[in-house]
Amino acid sequence: IWELKKDVYVVELDWYPDAPGEMVVLTCDTPEEDGITWTLDQSSEVLGSGKTLTIQVKEFGDAGQYTCHKGGEVLSHSLLLLHKKEDGIWSTDILKDQKEPKNKTFLRCEAKNYSGRFTCWWLTTISTDLTFSVKSSRGSSDPQGVTCGAATLSAERVRGDNKEYEYSVECQEDSACPAAEESLPIEVMVDAVHKLKYENYTSSFFIRDIIKPDPPKNLQLKPLKNSRQVEVSWEYPDTWSTPHSYFSLTFCVQVQGKSKREKKDRVFTDKTSATVICRKNASISVRAQDRYYSSSWSEWASVPCS
Amino acid sequence: RAVPGGSSPAWTQCQQLSQKLCTLAWSAHPLVGHMDLREEGDEETTNDVPHIQCGDGCDPQGLRDNSQFCLQRIHQGLIFYEKLLGSDIFTGEPSLLPDSPVGQLHASLLGLSQLLQPEGHHWETQQIPSLSPSQPWQRLLLRFKILRSLQAFVAVAARVFAHGAATLSP
């Protein structure tokens, strides 16, 4: 058993049929010694008396808010949550496996630049009685500070018969050094509580591996005289790190016909313009990627040819 | 060339070669986090590689003030990786074909380090840890770790030379 926060405790249980469970001793936070009784949740049934209460925690029915009273007055509370371990593996019932980039990916994180700011998100099908708490650091043995906000519900989607909820959190490294080569990864830890179930999820990454620039901005076409060619131009996204002579991007320009089956013409360039042939009913799209490190491409910025 | 006394390197040549190094490093190990081996082996194996850290003056302001600190750090790293890529870690099994990007990477690391340091002048170089894994799986794990680390190192070096070519070239 360990303390998650004041008056909230997590009991770690090996979860299998007829498991013996864990013996837990609760102590009432009071100077009083006599006349103390204990109850669980809203029940008025007295579970025991005395300053301490010893219970055998085996299942969710044994978890909940234990309260000690004296003469009708509440003295203190202890909320017990359960953390299940099945076949040596901690349960992951609350969050959905996003399976990208690999199986058992529950947390996904992205950064728009090298400033040390990043966003993480996760998915669940649970709609109520759900709380999240997020902590982060750079490195684990001698951790350096990363400050995370509160996790918020950022999107709701219908997937078949189920509703899916996306939560996200923004974090910022306290003393970021955008130009340095990271040697210690960022660690992100999410505590999830659904009713009386506790689970924790972690992710470890370098900012450079989660970089995904915003799409290029101000995408424009300029027809070239007496030609089917056009000059496409664009600018670095506002959110990208500066100076651009140091934090450079590379770009992919694509000409795509109306039909998905039509052949795509692609050009790669380090410049912020390119000359392409604009076919009727086609569209021109441009996306960006860090020039020197192959992290994710941005989403496409697009304009129609006509 | 970054000769002693603080004269400038051939920024544009360094820029071109460092960008080529980035491409080669990603050709040699294009995939991220796909290894079944990643949980195995000793984490200490690549902890000794030289990193370009915050105080090394490789940020735009540091380069403007005095690029020598940063160039020396980059040179140290290039020599370190060049030695690793020429070692048994990369020559033993699993076999690399003669068209492997590792061979070109090795040559380009040497080429860039020579651009930064002419004959007759020696910056201090970091000691290479004596890593001599006997098993193919240990060797492969080390290769992947070294190449991932090299990708990060050459990305910073390429940014330095791109910025230098754009803002510090005579």
Epitope: - | H29, D36, P94
Partner: antibody, heavy 120, light 107 residues
Framework: QVQLVQSGAEVKKPGSSVKVSCKAS????????MHWMRQAPGQGLEWIGY????????KYNENFKGKVTITADKSTSTAYMELSSLRSEDTAVYYC?????????????WGQGTLVTVSS | EIVMTQSPATLSVSPGERATLSCKAS??????VAWYQQKPGQAPRLLLF???TRHTGIPARFSGSGSRTEFTLTISSLQSEDFAVYYC?????????FGGGTKVEIK
């Protein structure tokens, strides 16, 4: 796209030689090693060897040394595999293939195969 | 040379079922193993490399695992087009070698 097109089927007498060609397109021929495999009827695959067209260097499976010669013509982006002193056991489908560009020998593109039949 | 031993030689499976193919190397090959699919009259087609990484365009029902000497190819739910011969291949040591193949046939 990358393609490897092999020469047609051959029927040869024991003791003679045969030269199978593999024409490459869609990539820089000199930049990658070209490998040869064989598959006897109803059997598994055997790696014969490779040539690196950039410098002409070759490496052979010991089991095929003296039996096989691999060459390449840079001007036509074509690799050749010559089998000498043919015996009935050399009856097989011969494949050319190129590996991934990371420098390890998993084979991403294969020729369609050339059946060589050795029969008197 | 490294001997790659595949088992079983033939696997009879119903469409929609799971198929598990085994490959054992006579010595440590790290994860330098590829898997190929071959249909009659066709050249082999690459499925996986580094023991578990799917080649471009290969469906997610194909997965691989293992390291050093023991490797597995799993086809989670067999489709009609998956009935073929499967070969494992080590590219750790010269001469590169292939397993004898496992024929996956319709039950």
């Amino acid at each position: 796209q990358v393609q490897l097109v092999q020469s047609g089927a051959e029927v040869k007498k024991p003791g003679s030689s045969v030269k199978v060609s593999c024409k490459a397109s869609g990539y820089t021929f000199t930049a990658q090693t070209m490998h040869w495999m064989r598959q006897a009827p109803g059997q598994g695959l055997e790696w014969i060897g490779y040539i690196y067209p950039r410098d002409g260097s070759t490496k052979y499976n010991e089991n095929f040394k003296g039996k096989v010669t691999i060459t390449a013509d840079k001007s036509t982006s074509t690799a050749y595999m010559e089998l000498s002193s043919l015996r009935s056991e050399d009856t097989a489908v011969y494949y050319c293939a190129i590996p991934d560009r990371s420098g390890y020998a998993w084979f991403i593109v294969w020729g369609q195969g050339t059946l060589v039949t050795v029969s008197s | 040379e490294i001997v790659m031993t595949q088992s079983p030689a033939t696997l009879s499976v119903s469409p929609g079922e799971r198929a598990t193919l085994s490959c054992k190397a006579s010595r440590d090959v790290a994860i330098a193993v590829a898997w190929y699919q071959q249909k009659p009259g066709q050249a082999p087609r690459l499925l996986l490399f580094w023991a578990s990484t799917r080649h471009t365009g290969i469906p997610a029902r194909f997965s691989g695992s293992g390291s050093r000497t023991e490797f597995t190819l799993t086809i989670s739910s067999l489709q009609s087009e998956d009935f073929a011969v499967y070969y494992c291949h080590q590219y750790s040591s010269y001469p590169f070698t292939f397993g004898g193949g496992t024929k996956v046939e319709i039950k």
